[in-house]
Every structure is written in structure tokens, then in C-alpha cells.
């Protein structure tokens, strides 16, 4: 009987159960009642990261440093690129196919965490007792001076976006 | 012993008919492919048809220089096989040997054969 | 049908002597290439399958190589009892198709 379903790794074609082609080559020709699956090597510049039956390997991802992109890992038959972006820079995408420049947290915010080549900066405002005065990609919220530690009193209080004044204690009683 | 014994062959007028026997023993006939090959009298080997095993069905294949004039089958309870010849030509003279067709898919081949018989057709 | 062509037809040769036959296919075969040993009035006895394998049984000095149409059977040291015709066949297409022969005879 013709076989209607087969094993992991095969594929049904002409009533046969073929070998699909591994990771990094390429279908050339089905097999028959005679002969195997015939696979061919992918080239340099190509790649095919599963078992299959595509008679054309896809080609790299090109890293285009005119969108800011550089080669993370290189391809390899049976892996794709993997791009990443320039310093200062980050990927608009998961597939990263273009960078924008990370983003600068506003004064009142500070940098929770620093921008990777994948992920943008991530702002947290700055809570209370501490302030950031600067529009900074790397800056965290720093805390309000202590008066107290330096025998002075506060003169102004502090905001998210100014520390405290600090001045000499009133001497009169 | 793992072996094929042909029989049948002698002298028959062209047009007529002919039909060859092989003998199996010491292997599980009916898994199978079974074939048959001639060679004429200083020539080489030709491929003349085979039949399949039980698990396809035991269908057939013939060369075109015999496909409509010849028939195989076989017996697998008799574990025998067959070559019905008909409608019979002078170039089909030959020894005719019985042969068991083997392998996987990374190669088939011709791993047993039988001693031969000769058909010769002459008026 | 593919054709199968053996050089040289016959070829003469000592024991001890490095043979060298070949078999050339009218297209690609992909290894699907086997030889046969048939010795006078006897059935031909299958020595290499598959380009390179060797049959079971059959001695080490018959080995078999080549790719895509190009195919040899090498016999590194002729014994006495090698003297026989050699044939190759194609398992890649029906019809099954075999080289016209090559005899090799005691020099």
C-alpha cells in the first residue's frame, strides 16, 4: 500500500516517502522508488535553518550600515545574519531592520536602564528626594544634597527637576 | 542455501511462446523485487523486466524491447518466479537468468542470480 | 534510457598488475552505479554497489570510484581466478541499463 502519512523528517511526494533536505541544504530532486532525496549545500551568502524540501535557499540579511546597522554574528548555511545597531543607536524592530538614535530621558526623569543595540533607554520619573535636571541617554536620578550632613539647612526645597538650596542656620534664637 | 534455479528454456519457432521458471529457497521470496535479465549468445546483459514485492503490490516493469509480449509473475507460495515470453523474435535468443533485485535507497543492485537458461529462437 | 558506455572493450593483463576499468553514463547517475563480475558460462556476480560499496564477500583489492557520469573499477593486484568480464549498471533510471562489457585476459 502507498504510504498516506510519513515519518518525522520525510515528506510524501508521487506516493513515496522522501528525506527532507537538513539545515543548510537545498532540494535538488524528490527521491524515487530507487533512489534518495538528492541535497545540494547552500551557498557562502545563503541559508536554510530547517529540515526541508525548498529548492532555493534564502540569502542572508544584508547588514546596511546606511540605516545604522553592523553584523552582530555572521550567517553560516543553516544560520541567518544577525544584524545589530551602531553605538548610539538601537532597532526600531525584533527583526531589527533599521536604528534610531536611543532616547534621552527628560529632566524630571532619570535612566532606569541604558540603551542596547536592541532596546531604547528606559525612563522612570524621579521620585521623591531625588531629581534630574538633565535631558540625558546615561544620567540616573540623583539624590537631594543633604543639608543636614553639611550643617545647613534647606533654603529651597527640591524638585524632580532641581535639588534642594542648602544655607546657614538662622544663628538668632 | 540462498539460491535461484531457472528452467524452461530450449528451442521454440519465431512466434511462438515460452514460459521460464525460477526456483527461490533460503530468503523470504515475497520481500522481493524479483527480475529477470537476458544475455545473447557473446553479447552483453539486458535488463528485460521485474516485479515488485508484497508491499507494493507486486506490480510489474518491462524493458520496451519485451513490454506487451512478455509477462512476469510469481508464486510466492511456491516461492517461484515466472517469465511468460509470447509472440517470440530471433533476437530474443539468449540466456535468460532469473535474478533478485535488492537494496535501499542509497543503491539497488542484482545481489543473486540464477545459473541461466537458454531460450533460443530459430525456425 | 541512459547509456552506459566500458572502456577499454578488452584489455590484457599479468597478475600482480593495477586494473583499471571505466564506465561512462549518458547523464548525471548520481552513484546509482554498480559492477558485475560474470566469468564464462556462469551467472554474473555482483563485486560494487552504489559506486563505492563492496559487496559482501567480495575481496578488498576490488574497489570502485567517481561521480556524476564518470565511474571506474580498479582491481589493485589481478589475481588469476579476476580474469572474467566486468560489467556497470545504472540503478538511477528505468530502464536499468549495463555497460556493453569489458574482458580482461591473461597477458
Known amino acids: 500500500e502507498p504510504p498516506t502519512a510519513c515519518r518525522e523528517k520525510q515528506y510524501l511526494i508521487n506516493s513515496q516517502c522522501c528525506s527532507l533536505c537538513q539545515p543548510g541544504q537545498k532540494l535538488v530532486s524528490d527521491c524515487t522508488e530507487f533512489t534518495e532525496t538528492e541535497c545540494l549545500p547552500c551557498s557562502e551568502s545563503e541559508f536554510l535553518d530547517t529540515w526541508n524540501r525548498e529548492t532555493r535557499c534564502h540569502q542572508h540579511k544584508y547588514c546596511d550600515p546606511n540605516l545604522g546597522l553592523q553584523v552582530q554574528q555572521k550567517g553560516t548555511s543553516e544560520t541567518d545574519t544577525i544584524c545589530t545597531c551602531e553605538e548610539g543607536l538601537h532597532c526600531t524592530s525584533e527583526s531589527c531592520e533599521s536604528c534610531v538614535p536611543h532616547r534621552s530621558c527628560l529632566p524630571g526623569f532619570g535612566v532606569k536602564q541604558i540603551a542596547t543595540g536592541v532596546s531604547d533607554t528606559i525612563c522612570e520619573p524621579c521620585p521623591v528626594g531625588f531629581f534630574s535636571n538633565v535631558s540625558s541617554a546615561f544620567e540616573k536620578c540623583r539624590p537631594w544634597t543633604s543639608c543636614e550632613t553639611k550643617d545647613l539647612v534647606v533654603q529651597q526645597a527640591g524638585t524632580n527637576k532641581t535639588d534642594v538650596v542648602c544655607g546657614p542656620q538662622d544663628r538668632q534664637r | 542455501e540462498v539460491q535461484l534455479v531457472e528452467s524452461g528454456g530450449g528451442l521454440v519457432q519465431p512466434g511462438g511462446s515460452l514460459r521460464l521458471s525460477c526456483a527461490a529457497s533460503?530468503?523470504?521470496?515475497?520481500?522481493?523485487?524479483m527480475s529477470w535479465v537476458r544475455q545473447a549468445p557473446g553479447k552483453g546483459l539486458e535488463w528485460v523486466g521485474f516485479?515488485?514485492?508484497?508491499?507494493?503490490?507486486?506490480?510489474?516493469e518491462y524493458a520496451a524491447s519485451v513490454k506487451g509480449r512478455f509477462t512476469i509473475s510469481r508464486d510466492n507460495s511456491k516461492s517461484t518466479l515466472y517469465l511468460q515470453m509470447n509472440s517470440l523474435r530471433a533476437e530474443d535468443t539468449a540466456v535468460y537468468y532469473c535474478a533478485r533485485y535488492g537494496g535501499l535507497k542509497k543503491g539497488w543492485y542484482f545481489d543473486l542470480w540464477g545459473q541461466g537458461t537458454l531460450v533460443t529462437v530459430s525456425s | 534510457d541512459i547509456q552506459m558506455t566500458q572502456s577499454p572493450s578488452s584489455l590484457s593483463a599479468s597478475v600482480g598488475d593495477r586494473v583499471t576499468i571505466t564506465c561512462r553514463a549518458s547523464q548525471g547517475i548520481r552513484n546509482y552505479l554498480n559492477w558485475y563480475q560474470q566469468k564464462p558460462g556462469k551467472a554474473p556476480k555482483l563485486l560494487i554497489y552504489?559506486?563505492?560499496s563492496l559487496q559482501s564477500g567480495v575481496p578488498s583489492r576490488f574497489s570502485g570510484s567517481g561521480s556524476g557520469t564518470d565511474y571506474t573499477l580498479t582491481i589493485s593486484s589481478l589475481q588469476p581466478e579476476d580474469f572474467a568480464t566486468y560489467y556497470c549498471?545504472?540503478?538511477?533510471?528505468?530502464?536499468?541499463?549495463f555497460g556493453g562489457g569489458t574482458k580482461v585476459e591473461i597477458k
Open positions: 552504489y559506486t563505492s
Open positions: 516485479i515488485r514485492n508484497k508491499a507494493n503490490g507486486y506490480t510489474t
Open positions: 549498471q545504472q540503478g538511477i533510471n528505468l530502464p536499468w541499463t
Open positions: 533460503g530468503f523470504t521470496f515475497s520481500d522481493y523485487y
